[in-house]
Interface confidence: low
């Protein structure tokens, strides 16, 4: 088992909104749960967009999930990752990071 590296980034979307993207990379096996949570509850599937789980050329895999949120509400959102029985939670970085 190779645990994923998880990275959360943010980018400007429309006025007052930002897109937050959670990327998991370099993991094996390919089965993974990656989802955005608000106030400890997973967002519905129709408010999130997932990338395919793709091989990254090193015998491991990568994927991502993104969602659009209101600027200023970042602290209520976290990216949840579960892989091979391990799980972790990743906050949205502040504007300057």
């Amino acid at each position: 088992t190779v645990p994923p590296m998880v990275n959360v980034t943010r980018s400007n979307a429309s006025e007052g909104n930002i897109t937050v993207t959670c990327r998991a990379s370099s993991f094996y096996p390919r089965n993974i749960i990656l989802t955005w949570r608000q106030d400890n509850v997973s967002l519905s599937n129709d408010t999130q967009q997932w990338g395919d789980v793709l091989p990254d050329g090193n015998g491991t895999y990568q994927t991502w999930v993104a969602t659009r949120i209101c600027r200023g509400e970042e602290q209520n959102f976290t990216c949840y990752m579960e892989h091979s029985g391990n799980h972790s939670t990743h906050p949205v970085p502040s504007n300057g990071s």
Partner: antibody
């Protein structure tokens, strides 16, 4: 599953403040949501608020927004709740509890501290 | 706020009996993500509450299979198939779908 050890009983005067602690061990503190709950003797439970240890983000029951303030100290894996302007109505047992969540399922108060009795009396 | 109403207030049982506890919410408690965050807790005298059931029907780890939860929308039930002495105490239902999260008033299960 880990442990949650709460601070000892408090006897405080009306108008004063009290800061309760919930020291955790046995799990990754920063991955977790910690809630605080209130239970008056012989009564049901009330949810006060939660704090996400990873960022300090909070969500409050509006009833307690002027009364409670939640903080965390990640270096000691400890959650705190400061309760202010105490009245006799605030006399209760206060619990901290840890959320448990996997993927899209969730259990809100999976693991509990032993509770702290706060008595407000002149 | 979502009002959670539990009946009966007290439930006298004989050991080995089946017990059925009811919980009704004042509004539908399906979360926007489609899940129903309805939980059941047992509190014994002088102890912290313990989680039994989450998301209506899922037994928490270590909870015996004599406990089962069911229901949907606004009406929920906890059944204990054969009551044992360690099951006595106050049972609370709880909804975590709508903030503020709220508990029912409790049902006390005691010896008949």
């Amino acid at each position: 599953q880990g442990q949650m050890q709460q601070s000892g009983a408090e006897l405080v005067k009306p108008g004063a403040s009290v800061k309760l602690s919930c020291k955790t061990s046995g799990f990754t503190f920063s991955d977790n949501y910690i809630s605080w709950l209130k239970q008056k003797p012989g009564q049901s439970l009330e949810w006060i608020a939660w704090i996400y240890a990873g960022t300090g983000g909070t969500s409050y029951n509006q009833k307690f927004t002027a009364k409670a303030q939640l903080t965390v100290d990640t270096s000691s894996s400890t959650a705190y709740m400061q309760f202010s302007s105490l009245t006799t109505e605030d006399s209760a047992i206060y619990y901290c509890a840890r959320h448990d969540y996997y993927g899209t399922s969730g259990a809100w108060f999976a693991y509990w501290g032993q509770g702290t009795l706060v008595t407000v009396s002149a | 706020d979502v009002l959670m109403t539990q009946t009966p207030l007290s439930l006298p049982v004989s050991l080995g009996d089946q017990a059925s506890l009811s919980c009704r919410s004042s509004q539908n408690i399906v979360h926007i993500n489609g899940n129903t965050y309805l939980e059941w807790y047992l509190q014994k005298p002088g102890q912290s509450p313990k989680l039994l059931i989450y998301k209506v029907s899922n037994r928490f780890s270590g909870v015996p299979d004599r406990f089962s939860g069911s229901g949907s929308g606004t009406d929920f039930t906890l059944k204990i198939s054969r009551v044992e002495a360690e099951d006595l105490g106050v049972y609370y239902c709880f909804q975590g779908s709508h903030v503020p999260w709220t508990f029912g008033g409790g049902t006390k299960v005691e010896i008949k």
